[in-house]
């Protein structure tokens, strides 16, 4: 018996109620493998979710999401608001970076700006809360005479590490 | 799957310093931040710092300045602390743990094993 | 300075229902999202409870969270209560996004 149902091809399942005839699946339903007892039922793409890939007997349908908002997690599972350049979402919406961090996307959160110092280097363009300081050779490689190119130091939050 | 594993416990005398280490596994290291927490036996825990490994960049508590350093190593996706100057009052466990990039005020998703560190003479 | 206030011990009896609290001193609790953590001793934390009242895959649905606007805080509900889940549980939440805040925590003793 188990045998027949191995026939079974996706987009179809074995009817138990008909002698495990394959049948094929209902409407909004599918089955992407053979040999299945049931059909899963078809994922629909409503409210913040909007259909990229209609759902046919052998494939479940796939979402994307409205604009204004943006894919999270396995297969589009959730849809996140958008933030503009130099915001992060949180439980309020979209809050601007905190001083001495960034962000260069409408998703994601705030990171902090490059420690150039890490590198021995010195800060050649300050940062700001849509782009992280852009690092420049150290003060010793700058010729004798020559003008240091790092910005004054900005007043800082607590917390933040200078750069 | 997602892992943060930290280092041995450590014994210092007052005055010295010590680095602890938490390698991250199962994930993509640069692009989630750091926590670093403390929590003396049988007290709360205490938010020290955290560090973006994916560029360096650092924020520290204010009770905490002066007395920790984070680094990264992202070759070995492995965050450190330095603990300097050491006193008793630093005979804590200190947590590593990681937040999701969902949100700015998001959760730790995932907790490092959690480290012993002992100042005695 | 933004602090979040919990009762340092709460017990219960087995079976029972209980609401640990979490009341922030300043601001708007709804400000920010509250995630709570329950640690047994000698363990690191584990979330219960994420972005007020989200239940992580693997917690049993006993644990549920909420908030209160009218009192400033923060609950973590825990329903049919069980020997296991004797341990102290904290409270999490932000001064700003760059500084997270805890709770003192509340040890919960099963009776």
């Known amino acids: 018996l188990q045998d027949l149902c191995s026939n079974c091809p996706a987009g179809t399942f074995c009817d138990n109620n008909r002698s495990q005839i394959c049948s094929p699946c209902p409407p909004n339903s599918f089955s992407s493998a053979g040999g299945q007892r049931t059909c899963d039922i078809c994922r629909q793409c409503k409210g913040v979710f909007k259909t990229r890939k209609e759902c046919s007997s052998t494939s479940n349908a796939e979402c994307d999401c409205i604009s204004g908002y943006h894919c999270l997690g396995a297969e589009c599972s959730m849809c996140e608001q958008d933030c503009k350049q130099g915001q992060e979402l949180t439980k309020k919406g979209c809050k601007d970076c905190c001083f001495g961090t960034f962000n260069d996307q409408k998703r994601g959160i705030c990171r902090p700006w490059t420690n150039c110092s890490l590198d021995g280097k010195s800060v050649l363009v300050n940062g700001t809360k849509e782009r992280d300081v852009v690092c420049g050779p150290s003060p010793a490689d700058l010729s004798p005479g020559a003008s240091s190119a790092t910005p004054p130091a900005p007043a800082r939050e607590p917390g933040h590490s200078p750069q | 799957q997602v892992q943060l594993q930290q280092s041995g416990a450590e014994l210092a005398k007052p005055g010295t310093s010590v680095k602890l280490s938490c390698k991250a596994s199962?994930?993509?290291?640069?692009?989630?931040?750091i926590y670093w927490v403390k929590q003396r036996p049988g007290q709360g825990l205490e938010w020290i710092g955290n560090?973006?490994?994916?560029?360096?960049?650092?924020f520290y508590g204010e009770k905490f300045m002066g007395k920790a350093t984070f680094t990264a190593d992202t070759s070995s996706s492995t965050a450190y602390m330095l603990l300097g100057s050491l006193t008793p009052e630093d005979s804590a466990y200190y947590f590593c743990?990681?937040?999701?990039?969902?949100?700015?005020?998001?959760?730790?998703?995932?907790w490092g094993q959690g480290v012993l560190v002992t100042v005695s003479s | 300075q933004v602090v979040l206030t919990q009762p340092k011990s709460v017990s219960t009896s087995l079976k029972s229902t209980v609401k640990l609290s979490c009341k922030l001193n300043?601001?708007?609790?709804?400000?920010?999202?509250v995630h709570w953590y329950q640690q047994h001793a000698g363990r690191s934390p584990t979330t219960m409870i994420y972005?007020?009242?989200?239940?992580p895959d693997g917690v049993p649905d006993r644990f549920s969270g909420s908030i209160d606007s009218s009192s400033n805080s923060a609950f973590l509900t825990i329903n049919n209560v069980q020997t296991e889940d004797d341990a102290i549980y904290f409270c999490?939440?932000?001064?700003?996004?760059?500084?997270?805040?805890f709770g003192g925590g509340t040890k919960l003793t099963v009776l």
């Open positions: 743990a990681r937040r999701p990039d969902y949100s700015g005020d998001d959760y730790f998703d995932y």
């Open positions: 199962g994930y993509t290291f640069t692009s989630y931040y």
């Open positions: 560090i973006w490994p994916g560029n360096g960049g650092t």
């Open positions: 300043s601001g708007n609790i709804g400000s920010y999202y």
């Open positions: 972005r007020d009242d989200k239940r």
């Open positions: 999490h939440s932000y001064d700003s996004t760059i500084t997270p805040v």
